[in-house]
């Protein structure tokens, strides 16, 4: 179920790469965030809490990522025109219950000025 386009700036360009911002509510304690390109899983990050509130972060499909208290950022480097596509943040919430899934996304436009190694 697609919940719609992100109501925030999802793509932040810098140095020939892009930071893709996937937000989640502050109350979420345990979750899995997947970055989808079209229907393909590019990256994922799972945050769980063990006994004594020890936090565990795992990735099955690893990308450079950054976790904050209400977002996961995935970083893609060496942009070229093949990166242009729909990208989705697929959030699975485990805690607080119940299990919930949301899908938000947007289209990544690639312009010449954002490419990594432009020919001068």
């Amino acid at each position: 179920e697609i919940n719609g386009s992100a109501n925030y700036e999802m793509f932040i360009f810098h140095n020939g790469g892009v930071q893709i911002l996937c937000k989640y509510p502050d109350i979420v304690q345990q979750f899995k965030m997947q970055l989808l390109k079209g229907g393909q899983i590019l990256c994922d990050l799972t945050k769980t809490k063990g006994s004594g509130n020890t936090v565990s972060i795992k990735s099955l499909k690893f990308c450079h990522s950054q976790l904050s208290n209400n977002s996961v950022s995935f970083f893609l480097y060496n942009l070229d025109h093949s990166h242009a596509n729909y990208y989705f943040c697929n959030l699975s919430i485990f805690d607080p219950p119940p299990f919930k899934v949301t899908l938000t996304g947007g289209y990544l436009h690639i312009y010449e000025s954002q490419l990594c190694c432009q020919l001068k």
Epitope: E1, P25, I27, F94, D95, P97, P98, F99, K100, V101
Partner: antibody, heavy 120, light 106 residues
């Protein structure tokens, strides 16, 4: 057809115990997150406890923590609620209910309910 | 805890009427809201999930709308089978229900 059938309710004295059962049929029980809800006479609905599929993560409402224990047996397609140290305020009809599988929420299948009366 | 407040508590209506029930959450719950119908001595029956999605098998005269803190359940043309009590339920964080709205015959 898809069905949940509760049993095990009855009259019990304050401080006593009961074990409620919920027999599932017509669907793959092990795939679903399951809940117990209750409804005191003439009152509204209240969530009691939740157990996830897979790892069996468990949650309780504050008023029953330390007294009630939820469990499931996928081999028997059954959900249980062990109720100890019962109080008058636990008097209610108890329902088991299945959470929608898709992560969109809502309890799409409910049992018919079993009545628990706590009285001296 | 998230509190859910339904209004009205009781609603008197006639067959064919358009009926609207409101549910207000004490904080934003996005669209994580369900609506149930319950008849005396029976279990609740899911009508709407995710604020506006109609559960399979539920008549199309039932519809839900809203997001954030304000939600409504609308019955476009009340039928004899619709006289019952209706509950909203948030599941943004755990589960809490509104106190119920009894729809009775005028």
């Amino acid at each position: 057809q898809v069905q949940l059938v509760e049993s095990g309710g009855g009259l019990v004295k304050p401080g006593g115990s009961l074990r409620l059962s919920c027999a599932a049929s017509g669907f793959t029980f092990s795939d679903y997150y399951m809940n117990w809800f209750r409804q005191a006479p003439g009152k509204g609905l209240e969530w009691v406890s939740y157990i996830s599929s897979g790892d069996g993560t468990i949650y309780y409402t504050d008023s029953v923590k330390g007294r009630f224990t939820i469990s499931r047996d996928s081999a028997k397609n059954s959900l249980y609620l062990q109720m100890n140290s019962l109080r008058a305020e636990d008097t209610a009809v108890y329902y088991c209910a299945r959470d929608r599988l898709t992560g969109t929420g809502g309890m799409d299948v409910w049992g018919q309910g079993t009545t628990v009366t706590v009285s001296s | 805890d998230i509190q859910m407040t339904q209004s009205p508590s009781t609603l008197s209506a006639s067959v064919g009427d358009r009926v609207t029930i409101t549910c207000r959450a004490s904080q934003s719950i996005s669209s994580w809201l369900a609506w149930y119908q319950q008849k005396p001595g029976k279990a609740p029956n899911l009508l709407i999930y995710k604020a506006s999605s109609l559960e399979s098998g539920v008549p199309s005269r039932f519809s839900g709308s809203g997001s954030g803190t304000e939600f409504t359940l609308t019955i476009s043309s009340l039928q004899p089978d619709d006289f019952a009590t209706y509950y909203c339920q948030q599941y943004y964080s755990y589960w809490t229900f509104g106190q119920g709205t009894k729809v009775e015959i005028k």
